[in-house]
Amino acid sequence: CKAMHVAQPAVVLASSRGIASFVCEYASPGKATEVRVTVLRQADSQVTEVCAATYMMGNELTFLDDSICTGTSSGNQVNLTIQGLRAMDTGLYICKVELMYPPPYYLGIGNGTQIYVIDPEPCPDSDF
């Protein structure tokens, strides 16, 4: 397994609708044609997988139908969007990139993006 550098922003604030977007950029040592991108969440020293997608270079990222993630790719950059976030989902979101083809296999893990989610205040009751 060969190591690869992955860069991602340190901090992102989710929108009031619970949507957070960030760019995951990897330093590809060669011309990879099949790439796997995984988003992991680290909170209280516990790591869980949020979503994952394998894509062929030049094609769209395809996450599972029930995934909370969507994304697009451009060169060595992946634009990731996570939706449906609530305050309890605040945590460190780590981008993992694997170059699956051609050999050799490369694995890169970013330092993580701290996503802050603030639940919107409920609207006050209207008098009319």
Partner: nanobody
Framework: EVQLVESGGGLVQPGGSLRLSCAAS????????MGWYRQAPGNQRDLVAS???????YYADSVKGRFTISRDGAKNTVYLQMNSLKPEDTAVYYC?????????????WGQGTQVTVSS
């Protein structure tokens, strides 16, 4: 823990064929590169063929046109069909699953199966 069990090796004459099988414990094909490596006495372990989750196949130059890698997701098994075998194909063949689990790389090996090509 992933377990890989190879079978199908044996003694075959030059020009003959063999099919190696590698049975995996669980469906690991969706996130692992499955590969066949071989190691002849006194040599290092070399990649012969591999198949990715997306179905991309790689072959070493020495086996192109003679060997075919395939997989059966329903049986959790990966195969290596070896045709037109040569004496220089003699080696121990190992099945490999390579990928990652959460933040850690993973690299699993089978116990190996001997292939001998001799008249």
């Amino acid at each position: 823990e992933v377990q890989l069990v190879e079978s199908g090796g044996g003694l075959v004459q030059p020009g003959g064929s063999l099919r190696l099988s590698c049975a995996a414990s669980g469906n690991i094909f969706t996130r692992n590169i499955m590969g066949w490596y071989r190691q002849a006495p006194g040599n290092q372990r070399d990649l012969v063929a591999s198949i990715t989750p997306g179905g991309n196949m790689y072959y070493a130059d020495s086996v192109k046109g003679r060997f075919t890698i395939s997989r059966d997701g329903a049986k959790n098994t990966v195969y290596l069909q070896m045709n037109s075998l040569k004496p220089e194909d003699t080696a121990v063949y190992y099945c490999n699953a390579r990928g990652s689990i959460l933040l850690d790389p993973s690299n699993y090996w089978g116990q190996g199966t001997q292939v001998t090509v001799s008249s």
